[in-house]
Interface confidence: low
């Protein structure tokens, strides 16, 4: 029977530790059923619409680059973007829109309107999230687009503002 | 030892392709452990409190009839619904309710007030989502009730309105 | 090889049920592969801004005690919790905050601002939530802060405030 | 379990002030509205007005230039003063916490005016 | 301000009977309704608050249902201790006003 000697290719994991051929439970417990996720928080500083993330966060089987989480194994995933929005009202209302993209498409958006009454207050805090369920193929992308980014408020709450992926079902 | 001419009934899936009876990392890969989860867009025409939904969404181990989604594998599930409101303020606030179901009981709402300041916006862009964990059986149903549907956004947005569902753990 | 009558500890869960060594199928349906989840609703009288939950809820492989969810296996875990507000409004307008906090350091936290016109409605309905994914080590413990909590709105929507945590990979 | 309780002389002459206090007791003042509502003989109830903690009040339009509420967070009690009063202001006076509708009570003061 | 009227302002019911009290609002109130149960020389008891929830402690036969402006009070099954004063109130807007009130009397 298939040893820990099985050579290290994507598909074929070596079963870690130990030589445990013979142990089924053993054999089970380690067993490659391959998960991915990532859970990155946004940059400190936006200039655009798309949003950039901070690369120093969670990522195992996903890659990150230029504002993309970029899949890595193929399957139904599960995506997630919270943020926090900081308003200065203006005299009218403000919409704030999320936008979560696929490929640069547009999946799915979440909008709220605030500053509803005007001047009647300072500042107004939001919070806006969105989810995904979808099927991702290899080298799929996933971003996100805020038109408000300006209002996105990185300084009090750094940690507020999250993009994160996981793998529900992989598509062996 | 078993082969892949298990014979193909719920709980004896036949391990796909090839025969690698030999072979356990082969077997562990093709392993049916049992997911099911479905994700459903609000049909674009809604005319009660009971949200109707796009039934050629996602669907896998799920059945949806007449509004609910019906589960066929029992376990503990993450159920989530998430909807975009459109209100057009009349002069007095307005409070957005969303009922997850199980079986027809209400097991969890949300509820906001929009239009607070009465008439100083046209509209006001509402996003509202609910969660539930909770364990289900074969044939439970899980839908969804808002008051008022007629403000929920399926023009602008016919993408942003959903039901879903995954099985978490299974009570094999 | 390995058998039912594997010691029962934590790491050598018996395979349930009948003897089944030699049918690889059967073995892999019972595989001890860990899950832990919670979900618990919010205690009816709440007096201090720590929240306490009632421990009738659902609880497997995590633990309750003075406020915490007490984690018992490593892993990485997905935390959420989802709180409704009922707010008289007074003359300003008030800020609603939910922190989670990991081992007493707030990891995460959403705000969201109310009664921004005023006396114009008596009572404001808010539904906030916050997630996180995160590692978790053995006896972490997880709890959430609410500084304005008196308006956690626990006699009419007692089910609608939880906190819920489900481990996504364990770090075997 | 909350309690309330009004204090408060029982008989004010026509045109002086009508002095309550209430005392909460078993749970803080903090985060709720509080209520004076009033009953006069043989008939039904009215709302005075309300404070929050923060001190922010609001009262009955057809009592609003007589009414005072305050409150004292550090002793856990809100008072009423109701100034220029006349027989038609004898009343049984209730306070009460406003969390939705009054959940709480006090056992009520009568307070009579005459002279 | 928003006029608070209950119907009957007197009932007669024994023992056993089911009785419903109807409070009617000058307008819309959403559900910001609630009931207190009254007796002779003691402050008002909240039963019933936002239209049909039952506060704590108060015993089942007690119901509350209605939308909007129109509202009802039900006893299932009147006990010895149910004969009192009964009230509605609305604090949907300022300032908050009660209903005149219903004497329920043993028949």
């Known amino acids: 029977q298939r040893t820990d000697s099985i050579p290290n290719s994507p598909d074929n994991i070596p079963l870690r530790g130990g030589n445990c051929s013979e142990d089924l439970l053993c054999i089970l417990k380690r067993a490659p059923f391959k998960k991915s996720w990532a859970y990155l928080q946004v940059a400190k500083h936006l200039n655009k619409t798309k949003l950039s993330w901070n690369k120093d966060g969670i990522l195992h089987g996903v890659r990150y680059q230029d504002g993309n989480l970029v899949i890595q194994f193929p399957g139904l995933y599960f995506i997630i973007c919270q943020l926090q929005f900081l308003v200065q009202c203006p005299n009218n209302s403000v919409d704030l829109k999320l936008e979560l993209l696929i490929n640069k498409h547009i999946k799915k958006q979440a909008l709220v309107t605030v500053c509803e009454s005007g001047m009647q207050t300072k500042h107004v805090y939001q919070n806006l999230s969105q989810f995904l369920l979808d099927y991702l193929q290899v080298n799929t992308t996933v971003s996100v687009n805020v038109d408000t980014f300006q209002y996105i408020d990185t300084s009090t709450f750094p940690l507020e503002n999250v993009l994160s992926v996981f793998l529900y079902s992989n598509s062996d | 030892q078993r082969t892949d001419s298990i014979p193909n009934s719920p709980d004896n899936i036949p391990l796909r392709g090839g025969n690698c009876s030999e072979d356990l990392l082969c077997i562990l890969k093709r392993a049916p452990f049992k997911k099911s989860w479905a994700y459903l867009q609000v049909a674009k025409h809604l005319n009660k409190t009971k949200l109707s939904w796009n039934k050629d969404g996602i669907l896998h181990g799920v059945r949806y009839q007449d509004g609910n989604l019906v589960i066929q594998f029992p376990g503990l599930y993450f159920i989530i619904c998430q909807l975009q409101f459109l209100v057009q303020c009349p002069n007095n606030s307005v409070d957005l309710k969303l009922e997850l179901l199980i079986n027809k009981h209400i097991k969890k709402q949300a509820l906001v007030t929009v239009c607070e300041s009465g008439m100083q916006t046209k509209h006001v862009y509402q996003n509202l989502s609910q969660f539930l964990l909770d364990y289900l059986q074969v044939n439970t149903t899980v839908s969804v009730n808002v008051d008022t549907f007629q403000y929920i956004d399926t023009s602008t947005f016919p993408l942003e309105n959903v039901l879903s569902v995954f099985l978490y753990s299974n009570s094999d | 090889q390995r058998t039912d009558s594997i010691p029962n500890s934590p790491d050598n869960i018996p395979l349930r049920g009948g003897n089944c060594s030699e049918d690889l199928l059967c073995i892999l349906k019972r595989a001890p592969f860990k899950k832990s989840w919670a979900y618990l609703q919010v205690a009816k009288h709440l007096n201090k801004t720590k929240l306490s939950w009632n421990k009738d809820g659902i609880l497997h492989g995590v633990r309750y005690q003075d406020g915490n969810l007490v984690i018992q296996f490593p892993g990485l875990y997905f935390i959420i919790c989802q709180l409704q507000f009922l707010v008289q409004c007074p003359n300003n307008s008030v800020d609603l905050k939910l922190e989670l906090l990991i081992n007493k350091h707030i990891k995460k936290q959403a705000l969201v601002t109310v009664c921004e016109s005023g006396m114009q409605t008596k009572h404001v309905y808010q539904n906030l939530s916050q997630f996180l994914l995160d590692y978790l080590q053995v006896n972490t413990t997880v709890s959430v802060n609410v500084d304005t909590f008196q308006y956690i709105d626990t006699s009419t929507f007692p089910l609608e405030n939880v906190l819920s945590v489900f481990l996504y990979s364990n770090s075997d | 379990q909350v309690q309330l309780q009004e204090s408060g002389p029982g008989l004010v002459k026509p045109s002086e002030t009508l002095s309550l206090t209430c005392t909460v007791s078993g749970g803080s003042i903090s985060g709720y509205y509080w209520s004076w509502i009033r009953q006069p003989p043989v008939k039904g109830l009215e709302w005075i007005g309300y404070?929050?903690?923060?001190?922010?009040?609001k009262y009955n339009p057809s009592l609003k230039s007589r009414v005072t509420i305050s409150v004292d967070t550090s002793k856990n009690q809100f008072s009423l003063k109701l100034s220029s009063v006349t027989a038609a202001d004898t009343a049984v006076y209730y306070c009460?916490?406003?969390?939705?509708?009054?959940?709480?009570w006090g056992q009520g003061a009568l307070v009579t005016v005459s002279s | 301000a928003i006029q608070m009227t209950q119907s009957p302002s007197y009932l007669s019911a024994s023992v056993g009977d089911r009785v419903t009290i109807a409070c009617r609002a000058s307008q819309g109130i959403r559900n910001n309704l609630g009931w207190y149960q009254q007796k002779p020389g003691k402050a008002p008891k909240l039963l019933i608050y936002?239209?049909?929830s039952l506060q704590s402690g108060v015993p089942s036969r007690f119901s509350g249902s209605g939308s909007g402006t129109d509202f009802t009070l039900t006893i299932s099954s009147l006990q010895p201790e149910d004969f009192a004063t009964y009230y509605c109130?609305?604090?949907?807007?300022?300032?908050?006003?009660f209903g005149q009130g219903t004497k329920l009397e043993i028949k």
């Open positions: 404070i929050f903690y923060s001190g922010y009040t």
């Open positions: 109130l609305q604090d949907f807007n300022y300032p908050y006003t």
């Open positions: 936002a239209e049909s």
């Open positions: 009460a916490r406003d969390r939705w509708d009054f959940d709480y």
